[in-house]
């Protein structure tokens, strides 16, 4: 593929780039060509060093396309004003740490100046710590250099985990790239993709990541690989003793006829079991419900209303033909 390279390619000021970096800003990673005339898959001649091939440089998966970039495969460096492992977190100015210094017009808080570790200058998973003058990178095994940018690891060392395919990296001066199998990510395929975080199971199904596959454990009334099918909850479900089936929320419910209860209306219900008659009223089971015979001085369907001494009741009015003390039918 075409590539414009100025005469000073491979130089940064007057300093030559350290292998495997080349290019005007020492940002292009190259490795020896696999054959005199062509480069391997995804690789191309790395001008101006025609005996090398350039590996495609890809940032860490998830690195923000707006606020992140990379200079080593698998890293994510943040542009000014952004932070976090994937450069998705704005540098906060909202917490007031000190009364001194310049303040933000919007919050009145101190705006911290850029620290030497902002944007994490340490590549390849190195951790950054501030020093009095600058910063220091603590590099993971297999990396070294000021910013952990130099890899001493080759494909021969098997740096790709979880069945990742290693490309490039024939010698310690060249970069390698891990092509991860489905379900894994990271510069060394070391991170399992939490596929359940995408909530693939619908209708409240429980997601199970089995490694080789995703499984959904569906709630009652739902089916399908992603619990996408809403089953007819009442299909084939009979409610006994004249009860009617009611669908709802992935489970069927029976609305039972009077005198019956339970999930399928198979249990004979004693309407008096709950002691519905207040103030010592006596309960009688009746074909249409229950009847309360109220103790003297009380009236109402559940004997809940006292009868006043002068004969007036607390009810607005007794229904015609119904005297205080008569049994009250509770429907």
């Amino acid at each position: 593929y075409p590539y414009d390279v100025p005469d000073y390619a491979g130089m940064l000021g007057s300093a030559r780039c350290e292998p495997p970096a080349v290019g005007t800003a020492c940002t292009r990673l190259c490795r020896p060509r696999s054959a005199p005339s062509r480069c391997g898959p995804g690789l191309r001649p790395c001008a101006p060093l025609e005996d090398e091939c350039e590996a495609p440089l890809v940032c860490r998966a998830g690195c923000s396309p707006e606020h992140g970039f990379c200079e080593q495969p698998g890293e994510c460096r943040c542009l000014e004003g952004w932070t976090g492992p994937l450069c998705t977190v704005p540098v906060s100015t909202s917490s007031c740490l000190s009364p001194r210094g310049p303040s933000s017009a919007t919050t009145g808080c101190l705006v911290p100046g850029p620290g030497p570790c902002d944007g994490n200058p340490c590549a390849n998973g190195g951790s950054c710590s501030e020093t009095p003058r600058s910063f220091e990178c603590t590099c993971p095994r297999g990396f070294y250099g000021l910013r952990c940018e130099v890899s001493g690891v080759t494909c021969a060392d098997g740096p790709c985990f979880n069945g990742g395919l290693c490309v490039g990296g024939a010698d310690p001066d060249s970069a390698y790239i891990c092509h991860c199998p489905p379900g894994f990510q990271g510069s060394n395929c070391e991170k399992r993709v939490d596929r359940c975080s995408l909530q693939p199971c619908r209708n409240g199904g429980l997601c199970l990541d089995l490694g080789h596959a995703l499984r959904c454990r569906c709630r009652a009334g739902f089916a399908g690989p992603r619990c996408e099918h809403d089953l007819d909850d009442c299909a084939g479900r009979a409610c006994a003793n004249g009860g009617t089936c009611v669908e709802g929320g992935g489970a069927h419910r029976c609305s039972c006829a009077l005198g019956f209860g339970g999930r399928d209306c198979r249990e004979r219900a004693d309407p008096c079991a709950a002691r519905p008659c207040a103030h010592g009223g006596r309960c009688y089971a009746h074909f249409s419900g229950l009847v309360c015979a109220c103790a003297p001085g009380y009236m109402g369907a559940r004997c809940e209303f006292p009868v006043h001494p002068d004969g007036a009741s607390a009810l607005p009015a007794a229904p015609p033909g119904l005297r205080p003390g008569d049994p009250q039918r509770y429907l």
Partner: antibody, heavy 120, light 107 residues
Framework: QITLKESGPTLVKPTQTLTLTCTFS??????????VGWIRQPPGKALEWLAL???????RYSPSLQTRLTITKDTPKNQVVLTMTNMDPVDTATYYC????????????WGRGTLVTVSS | EIVLTQSPATLSLSPGERATLSCRAS??????LAWYQQKPGQAPRLLIY???YRATGIPARFSGSGSGTDFTLTISSLEPEDFAVYYC?????????FGQGTRLEIK
């Protein structure tokens, strides 16, 4: 607030050279990691990537159009210029410029596009 | 170069329905695939990058999945403003390529 805006002729004749300018604000091409690219879209058709240029003057071109394309930047003016030689009616398209960060070869921020018609 | 094939070419659905769009790569692109939305007369807008990360300001009803060669964009419950053309794009190596697009239209 980042903005990108394309400008250039709306009509060019076959065999002529097209020169398009992308003027942007809210970021600088002197910032490490930042780049600007061009993408085109013929009427009713799909997007096609053309070229990219980065802060370090690294340039990338579409292989199918490499011989006809040149991308340059004017950092102080916040501009990127694309030239395309030997225009043909099939090059009639809306041309977009968009920002893309180094190693993160997606296009997160786009201009509104400019329609270029190639006709005699 | 990697060829991205999108299917279906056109998808006709109603608001509130679930949309599933597919993008297939001619060779593995790992998880380095993005989805864009384009409405008539507008520039494309980045929706999803690296297979399933949502871009800034994109509603949660948009989700992406897949890796290797097969990818899916899902819109869980379609809103009227979601009817547009959707493109996929890979960044696994040079040259960058886009799919031919899927038009999502109101039924």
């Amino acid at each position: 607030q980042i903005t990108l805006k394309e400008s250039g002729p709306t009509l060019v004749k076959p065999t002529q050279t097209l020169t398009l300018t992308c003027t942007f604000s809210g970021f600088s091409l002197s910032t490490r990691g930042v780049g600007v690219g061009w993408i085109r879209q013929p009427p009713g058709k799909a997007l096609e990537w053309l070229a990219l240029i980065y802060w370090n003057d690294d340039k990338r071109y579409s292989p199918s159009l490499q011989t006809r394309l040149t991308i340059t930047k004017d950092t102080p003016k916040n501009q990127v210029v694309l030239t395309m030689t030997n225009m043909d009616p099939v090059d009639t398209a809306t041309y977009y410029c968009a920002r893309s960060n180094w190693g993160n070869w997606y296009f997160a921020l786009w201009g509104r596009g400019t329609l270029v018609t190639v006709s005699s | 170069e990697i060829v991205l094939t999108q299917s279906p070419a056109t998808l006709s659905l109603s608001p509130g329905e679930r949309a599933t769009l597919s993008c297939r790569a001619s060779q593995s692109v790992s998880s380095y695939l993005a989805w864009y939305q384009q409405k008539p007369g507008q520039a494309p807008r980045l929706l999803i990058y690296d297979a399933f990360y949502r871009a800034t300001g994109i509603p949660a009803r948009f989700s992406g999945s897949g890796s290797g060669t097969d990818f899916t964009l899902t819109i869980s419950s379609l809103e009227p403003e979601d009817f547009a053309v959707y493109y996929c794009q890979h960044r696994s190596n040079w040259p960058i390529t886009f799919g031919q697009g899927t038009r999502l239209e109101i039924k």
